[in-house]
Every structure is written in structure tokens, then in C-alpha cells.
Interface confidence: medium
């Protein structure tokens, strides 16, 4: 029978009164227009609801929007437009929320055509009260806080200003002008590209990077010749056009720019680009595009100097510059992360690697699922996933893939099971183990979300007629209750429950129409009588991630350790609560060659784990540029995987190669920077 | 109940072998991973091989590594361990072990004792 | 190889009293140490996994803290059953081992 329909899904009794007794309703006084929502800190139950709406008159557009307050997660709303003065809030600046639990709320206004400058509302107190600013400038950009400290702001200006405040946005300095880009790094200090010449577009390629780390009283100048620039990790990423022609390299720095190294990739032309597909401490996922327009390119995986680059994936989709790419790290285990690949048949195919971009292979069939018209085989086929790429495309696909860190191994998404992703209508599949096996979820596209760290998935199915019915399963979407949430259906809109899936509540979002009036109304539904009781540690089981062959005692090891998670059992109704911790146990794995990677001159032959010198760089200079100075390089032929925590075992030691390079780009070598003071 | 039982320990010569049983009845001998452990005269403990449920996998330490052999017969719920070329300082009380789930020390035998000397 | 370095070799203790054990590894093992019981003449009896985790059956008396490179084994209220050998031992990574042991005498 069908998940849910069988006599073992009955667990969950009296569902109905439970939760009709938890189901708030509110209806917003509001033409519909759009509507965002955002969270306010951590656990606060604090969310603003921004509606705006927009009325065509002959000559101009009329703008009005009102803010909403709820401090009980969406159970109750409180209307405090009157707060900010009944302004109209420019909704494609959004509403920008301050880092971690600070409380503090920027809002940005719409002000008419000839004042001279912008104006905004500020909030400290989680949106309680707000201060009304006149800025001495238009803003760009949405106002961007310092990671390190939420009174430190910065905006770019409509004139390419670039401006910061020190007192959350009380007082605004221009610290510099003719700025296109402008990024916060570590330790409040700024990253900011200039132009000298006529403008960004113009000047793209001969920009300067600039560095201040006293928030505009002294400026380095750490890079010329400047395409783009991009922060990852501890990584910064420079791409800087070649001496010679229109092609251009990445260069990186993990000295906030006082040293540069070229990065071992392809250099790219114009029509070309690069991107950073992930980036933590330890390495960068890089995309590097094919010439031509052919919607692929290469991911590059760095060491963890960021410098010297193994190829990890061939023929990556990826449209165009800011376009789409399917690349998702799955947040629930580590070192797993899925995208799609473009065959020689211009079909996509999904592709997964449980090693951090070391192997890459295709999604195993769920056991509950036949192969579609896609697979030449009826019999051996994979699971497709669908992820932005397929909605930039219009599919039927209202979501793209979830995971979250603290619901372990736990994946949902949109998927077809054939030899490539179909555009028939998909599926919701489910993995329970980070993305080794997968089983049908629920039948058809559907939006959905987890609760509770786990404990609970809710889904809603994605139709184009109005809907009063949520689905909600207690043991990770094996088996589904039904719950009509209300008499009269609505136009769904969206799901929403607070970041970090740790809530029980979840709102549904959307609008009645009538014949005269349509209007916003959330529902929010709490699911705490549901789980009845908090759980103990007989509701949880041991789990050993990763692991493929039980027999084996270096099963589960990946990136030299593997771990075992105290998980939920599927058959404990119970709460892990709000200040429910992830409880792993780690241990270290014996080194084998897998554990390494080749060093700048060495490469793998294929099904062969050795790494061997390059023929064609044998007795030849390398050109190589290690932070901009002539020196020698010398290396073992490998080198530790970033992050891999293997011990003992194999340790490919060898003899210490003398590589002589020649610096071929000196551009960004220390000597060509310079200081400067206001 | 879960308990082990070793046999096999005795007196034999230097560069001699010997070969150490241990029977496992009261628990499912095929799902658990079994290790060798042995205690020397001065009460240190080293432990000395182990082998993954089904029999494929065996990790020894570097001092008996060539030397020994741990197997196993799931169908008699029953572990050995091989022992050739011994040496004086192979003399030990050994003890069987059971891997659990969580760790390798789970449940004990009660040891055999094997003395080489000349 | 991990080196386990167990204190003290041996104590003098009476019953009621409070004990500490301490094992120290000469790299990090995160929690991936045992404590093991020997009485005399006897077998090895498991007590703690994981460097806190008690196993079934143990008295709750006994305790394990520590992760890392630092731990120990907290026996309180001593009972007239707990004179005994105690010996740590690492499974972090092979090859496995052990503590130099701590005998719990009578004073």
C-alpha cells in the first residue's frame, strides 16, 4: 500500500482536536500585492511581515505598504505601520535583518524624486520601536552589516559612493567614491573595487581592489587590473586580466590580500566565467566555464592553501554568468553534495559526491520506484533531482532540495528516476542517510519543510487551485497524516517556519478571493501536542554515517574520520525540543592514499591512487606563482586533503622534489601595492 | 547469557605456534566483531588483533603482525587465533573480545594462558 | 602508536571515599576512550565507552569526563566491590591501547 495508508501510520491518535486547538488564523487588512517575511534573531518568535502594493495611476505608480509584528511565531499579528510613520518601504531593498541575536532591523523607504537623499527606519530592540534617518545619500544596495559588529554598516550610493556608519546607521561618512563592489571580510574590515576611468562596465578588467581594515581611515591597494572579486572561507579570490590578452586567472590571498598566489586553474576569456560554488576554512568548490556558449564548465576542488586544484567534476551545468547551477552542499552530512552534469546528449543527470568533490557518481534507484521513459534500461536507472535549474525552467518543481545540519541525514527533494531528469511532473523522494539511498516520499511536486530537528516533515501539495490541507509525517515521510487547517480553502503562497528547523510551528501562507477584495491570511499551526513528551535516550538509536560496508572497520571513514549520531528512532512520537544538540562521536581513521591529493606537478592516472609527476613539466620551470616572489617549490608529490583528520596508516612520503618556476604574473606581488591615509 | 570461554593456552617453545579458541554461545556471534587482547606478567594490557563480523576484514598490531592469524567460523560461533614463530615475550594471559556497536571492549572472556619458554 | 598514560599506578582508599582516575593520550582521541574493570583473579568487566557513556548495569556511582588529549574515571562513595584494577584504553585508531592500570587498594 501507499506511505500512509497502511495499518502501521495510524500512531498518531486524536490528531485532529490536538491540532485544531493549536491552528491560529490571522487575516491581514491588506489588498494582496506582495508580502515578505523575515525572522528577527534566534528563538525570539519575532517576525515582521512587510505587505506592499502597488497602484497604477496614468502618470506615476502609488506605492503603500504596511509592517506587521508577531513575537509568538506567527500566532498573532500586530499592524505597527504607524511605527514607521506610514512610509512606503522599498521591497526590492528588503528588510535587512542584523547577524545573530542583535535585535536590529533596517528598513529602507521610498522618498520622493527630489530629495537628497534616502531615509531609513532602524530598529534595535527585535522591531519593538524604530528611528526614522535621513540619509545624505540614494542607496544602491541594501544596507550590510559587519559579521563582527551589527552597529557597523555599509551601502553603496546610486553616484558609486561607498558609505559606512559606525552607530547603526545614526551617522553616515563617505569613505570613498567611484566604488563598485564593496564586501566585509574578517574583523570589520572592508574589501571594495574601484574604477579610475569612466564606470564599473566600462572599467571591468582595469579595476583596483582597495582594503581598509579602520573603516576608511587608511586604504591599501591590493590588487590592479581587477575583473571581479569574491570572499570564501578564508579564502579571497581575485580574478585579474593577464598581461598580454583579454584572458583572465584567479589569484588568492589568505592574508586579507597582502600576499597573492595563482591559482593552479584554466584561465578563462571574456565570454567566460568563474565561480565559487562553496567555500569553507578548509578548501573552495570553483567553477571554472567551457568557452562557448555551452551552459557547462569544470568544479575545480583547492588544497587548503587554496592554490593547487584537482578536477572534480566535468561537463558541471551551469548557464551563464549569475545564471543557474543545480550545486547543493547538503547541510545534514558531511562532505555530501549533489548538482547536474550536461551529457553529450544534452540530457541532465544528477550527480553526487559523499567525499567532498573526490568521487562523483549518480543517485542510487529507490527501491520503491520504477524508471520512467527516460531510462533505455527498465530496469537500472538513477534518481534525478531537481534543483534551480529545473525551476528557472518553469518545471513543476516548487522547491529545491532541503537539508538542515541539525536533522541528520536527512534529504528532501523533487525528483525523477530514469537516465536523466524528465519534465514530466516529479516526485518528492526522500534519503534518510545523507544521500545514499532514497525512497518515493510523496506522490507529485509538493512544498515542504522539517520541524523539530527531524521529528516532524510537513508538506504541502503544489496545485493551482485553492487548498485547506496540510500533510504531516512523524517518522522522516514514511508514513502521512492529513489535517484540514480550515473550512474555506486559500491560495497558497508559501510555507514558512523559523531558520534552523528547530521550531514547531510552521505558517502557511496565502490569499482568499472574493468577488470584490482579496486578502493576505497566515495560518500558523503549532505542533507541540502532537509530540507529546520531550525525548529520552531510549527514543534514539546509534547511526554510523557514511557507512556502506558494515563488515569493514574503516566503513563510515570519510576525509580520514567517521562518526556516529545518536538519532531519533522513526517510531518515537516525542519532541527533541528548541535546545536539541546533534550528539556525534567521532573517531580517526588509518591514512590511505585517499587521503591525499596531488601536489602542482602531479597528477592521478586513472584507477590509480599513486600520484605521479607530470610528463610534460619533467626539467621544465613551472609557472608558478607562489605569493608573487621567485622561489623554490618543493613538494612530496602529495598533500592532505583540507580537513581530512587521518592518522597513521599509509604516509606517502617521498623524495622532496626542487621545482624551479618562473612567476609569469607579478602583478599582484607585494611590491606593487601601496598604502594610503585619509 | 552473553559469555566467552578461551581455550587452547599452554607451554610451548620458542619459534613453536599454538592455536587459541574462543566459543561464544548466548548472544549472535555473526553480527559482532571480535578482538584478541592479551595480558602480560607485569599486568600491562596489548591488544592484538581484531576481526570484523563476517570474517573480511583483520587488523593486527605491528608486534604480532606476520606472525598470527585471527579467523573465525560463524557457523560454530567460535573465534581463533593462529599463533606461529612465538617469542618469550608472546607469553600472556589472552583474552577474547567482543565489539559492540559502540566500542571494542564490550564483553570478556575469561582467559588462557600461554607461556613460551625453553 | 597513542600512548595512554594512566595516574596514579596504584592508591590507597577507604570505603565511602571519592576516587579520580586520570588517563592521559599523547595526541586527541576526542571521546573515544573505555574504562575497564579487573578484579583480582578475574576477567575484564566494561564500565564506560565513549569517555562518559555508562554502560548497562554499571552502578551510577562510576563516571567518566574528559575529551581530547585528558580524562578520568570517578568512582564515588566507594563500595567494598570496587577494589579492583581500572586500565583506559583508546580505540581512536588502530592499533588500540591501553592505560598502565590503577590498582584500588584498602588503606
Known amino acids: 500500500s501507499a506511505p500512509g495508508e497502511d495499518e502501521e501510520c495510524g500512531r498518531v491518535r486524536d490528531f485532529v482536536a490536538k491540532l485544531a486547538n493549536n491552528t491560529h488564523q490571522h487575516v491581514f487588512d491588506d489588498l494582496r500585492g506582495s508580502v515578505s517575511l523575515s525572522w528577527v534573531g534566534d528563538s525570539t518568535g519575532v517576525i515582521l511581515v512587510l505587505t506592499t502594493f502597488h497602484v497604477p495611476l496614468v502618470i506615476m505608480t502609488f506605492g503603500q505598504s504596511k509592517l506587521y509584528r508577531s513575537e509568538d511565531y506567527g500566532k498573532n499579528f500586530k499592524d505597527i505601520t504607524d511605527l514607521i510613520n506610514n512610509t512606503f518601504i522599498r521591497t526590492e531593498f528588503g528588510m535587512a535583518i542584523g547577524p545573530e541575536n542583535s535585535g536590529k532591523v533596517v528598513l529602507t523607504a521610498e522618498v520622493s524624486g527630489g530629495s537628497r537623499g534616502g531615509r531609513i527606519f532602524r530598529s534595535s530592540d527585535f522591531a519593538k520601536n524604530f528611528v526614522q534617518t535621513d540619509l545624505p545619500f540614494h542607496p544602491l544596495t541594501q544596507m550590510m552589516y559587519s559579521p563582527q559588529n551589527s552597529d557597523y554598516l555599509l551601502a553603496l550610493s546610486t553616484e558609486n559612493g561607498l558609505w559606512v556608519s559606525k552607530n547603526f546607521g545614526g551617522k553616515w561618512e563617505e569613505i570613498h567614491k567611484a566604488v563598485c563592489l564593496a564586501k566585509w571580510g574578517s574583523d570589520n574590515t572592508i574589501f571594495f573595487t574601484t574604477y579610475a576611468n569612466g564606470s564599473c562596465k566600462a572599467d571591468l578588467g582595469a579595476l583596483e581592489l582597495w582594503r581598509t581594515s579602520d573603516l576608511g581611515k587608511s586604504f591599501k591597494t591590493i590588487g590592479v587590473k581587477i575583473y571581479s572579486f569574491g570572499l570564501g572561507g578564508r579564502f579571497l579570490f581575485a580574478s585579474v586580466m593577464a598581461d598580454k590578452d583579454t584572458t583572465r586567472r584567479i589569484h588568492v590571498s589568505t592574508d586579507q590580500g597582502d600576499t597573492w598566489s595563482m591559482a593552479q586553474l584554466p584561465s578563462v576569456g571574456q565570454e567566460q566565467f568563474y565561480s565559487i560554488l562553496a567555500a569553507n576554512d578548509d578548501m573552495v568548490f570553483m567553477h571554472v566555464d567551457e568557452p562557448g556558449d555551452t551552459g557547462f564548465g569544470t568544479i575545480f576542488t583547492s588544497d587548503d592553501r587554496g592554490i593547487v586544484y584537482s578536477k572534480s567534476l566535468d561537463r558541471h551545468l551551469y548557464t551563464t554568468t549569475g545564471g543557474e547551477t543545480d550545486f547543493t552542499n547538503v547541510t545534514s552530512l558531511r562532505g555530501v553534495y549533489i548538482t547536474s552534469v550536461l551529457s553529450e546528449d544534452n540530457s541532465i543527470q544528477t550527480m553526487i559526491t559523499f567525499d567532498q568533490g573526490g568521487r562523483w557518481t549518480h543517485l542510487r534507484k529507490p527501491e520503491n520506484s520504477e524508471c520512467d521513459a527516460t531510462a533505455k534500461n527498465k530496469n537500472e536507472c538513477s534518481l534525478h533531482i531537481h534543483a534551480s535549474y529545473s525551476i528557472s525552467q518553469k518545471l513543476n518543481v516548487p522547491m529545491a532540495p532541503l537539508s538542515e545540519p541539525n536533522a541528520v541525514g536527512i534529504v528532501i527533494a523533487h525528483g525523477s528516476v530514469g537516465d536523466a531528469i524528465s519534465v514530466m511532473v516529479p516526485d518528492v523522494y526522500i534519503s534518510d542517510d545523507g544521500g545514499y539511498s532514497w525512497t518515493k516520499m510523496l506522490e507529485g511536486p509538493h512544498y515542504y519543510t522539517i520541524l523539530d530537528s527531524g521529528g516532524i516533515i510537513v508538506a504541502i501539495e503544489h496545485s493551482s487551485r485553492p487548498i485547506n490541507v496540510i500533510k504531516f509525517s512523524t517518522d522522516e515521510g514514511q508514513c502521512w497524516q492529513t489535517y484540514t487547517f480550515t473550512r474555506d480553502p486559500i491560495y497558497f503562497t508559501g510555507l514558512a517556519s523559523e531558520p534552523g528547523a528547530r521550531s514547531m510551528n510552521i505558517s502557511i501562507w496565502g490569499f482568499t478571493e472574493s468577488f470584490l477584495t482579496s486578502q493576505w491570511v497566515s495560518y500558523t499551526i503549532d505542533f507541540k501536542d502532537i509530540l507529546e513528551r520531550n525525548c529520552e535516550e531510549k527514543d534514539y538509536t546509534i547511526w554510523l554515517a557514511h557507512s556502506t560496508d558494515p563488515e569493514d572497520y574503516e566503513d563510515g571513514c570519510i576525509l580520514g574520520y567517521k562518526e556516529q549520531f545518536l538519532r531519533l528512532r522513526k517510531s518515537s512520537v516525542c519532541q527533541n525540543g528548541r535546545d536539541y544538540v546533534v550528539t556525534k562521536q567521532p573517531s580517526i581513521c588509518l591514512c590511505s592514499l585517499e587521503d591525499f591529493l596531488c601536489d602542482f606537478g602531479y597528477y592521478r592516472p586513472e584507477n590509480d591512487s599513486k600520484c605521479v609527476e607530470q610528463p610534460e613539466l619533467k626539467g621544465h620551470d613551472l609557472e608558478f606563482c607562489l605569493y608573487g616572489r621567485e622561489e623554490h617549490l618543493t613538494t612530496n608529490g602529495y598533500r592532505k586533503i583540507p580537513g581530512d583528520k587521518c592518522q597513521g596508516g599509509v604516509n606517502p612520503v617521498r623524495e622532496v622534489k626542487d621545482l624551479k618556476k618562473k612567476c609569469t604574473s607579478n602583478f599582484l606581488s607585494p611590491e606593487k601595492q601601496n598604502s594610503k591615509s585619509n | 547469557e552473553v559469555q566467552l570461554v578461551e581455550s587452547g593456552g599452554d607451554l610451548v617453545k620458542p619459534g613453536g605456534s599454538l592455536k587459541l579458541s574462543c566459543a561464544a554461545p548466548?548472544?549472535?556471534?555473526?553480527?559482532?566483531?571480535m578482538s584478541w587482547v592479551r595480558q602480560t606478567p607485569d599486568k600491562r594490557l596489548e591488544w592484538v588483533a581484531i576481526?570484523?563480523?563476517?570474517?573480511?576484514?583483520?587488523y593486527y598490531s605491528d608486534t604480532v603482525k606476520g606472525r598470527f592469524t585471527i579467523s573465525r567460523d560463524n557457523a560454530k560461533n567460535t573465534l581463533n587465533l593462529q599463533m606461529s614463530s612465538l617469542k618469550s615475550e608472546d607469553t600472556a594471559m589472552y583474552f577474547c573480545?567482543?565489539?559492540?556497536?559502540?566500542?571494542?571492549?564490550?564483553?570478556w572472556g575469561t582467559g588462557t594462558t600461554v607461556t613460551v619458554s625453553s | 602508536d597513542i600512548l595512554m598514560t594512566q595516574f596514579p599506578s596504584s592508591m590507597s582508599v577507604s570505603l565511602g571515599d571519592t576516587v579520580s582516575i586520570t588517563c592521559h593520550a599523547s595526541?586527541?582521541?576526542?571521546?573515544?576512550i573505555g574504562w575497564l574493570q579487573q578484579k583480582p583473579g578475574k576477567s575484564f568487566k566494561g564500565l564506560i565507552y565513549?569517555?562518559?557513556n555508562l554502560k548497562d548495569g554499571v552502578p551510577s556511582r562510576f563516571s567518566g569526563s574528559g575529551s581530547g588529549t585528558d580524562f578520568s574515571l570517578t568512582i564515588s562513595s566507594l563500595e567494598s566491590e570496587d577494589f579492583a584494577d581500572y586500565y583506559c584504553?583508546?580505540?581512536?585508531?588502530?592499533?588500540?591501547?591501553f592505560g598502565g592500570g590503577t590498582k584500588l587498594e584498602k588503606r
Open positions: 573480545s567482543r565489539s559492540s556497536s559502540h566500542w571494542y571492549f564490550d564483553v
Open positions: 548466548g548472544f549472535t556471534f555473526s553480527t559482532y566483531g
Open positions: 576481526i570484523s563480523s563476517g570474517g573480511s576484514y583483520t
Open positions: 595526541q586527541g582521541i576526542s571521546s573515544n
Open positions: 565513549h569517555g562518559t
Open positions: 584504553v583508546q580505540y581512536a585508531q588502530f592499533p588500540y591501547t
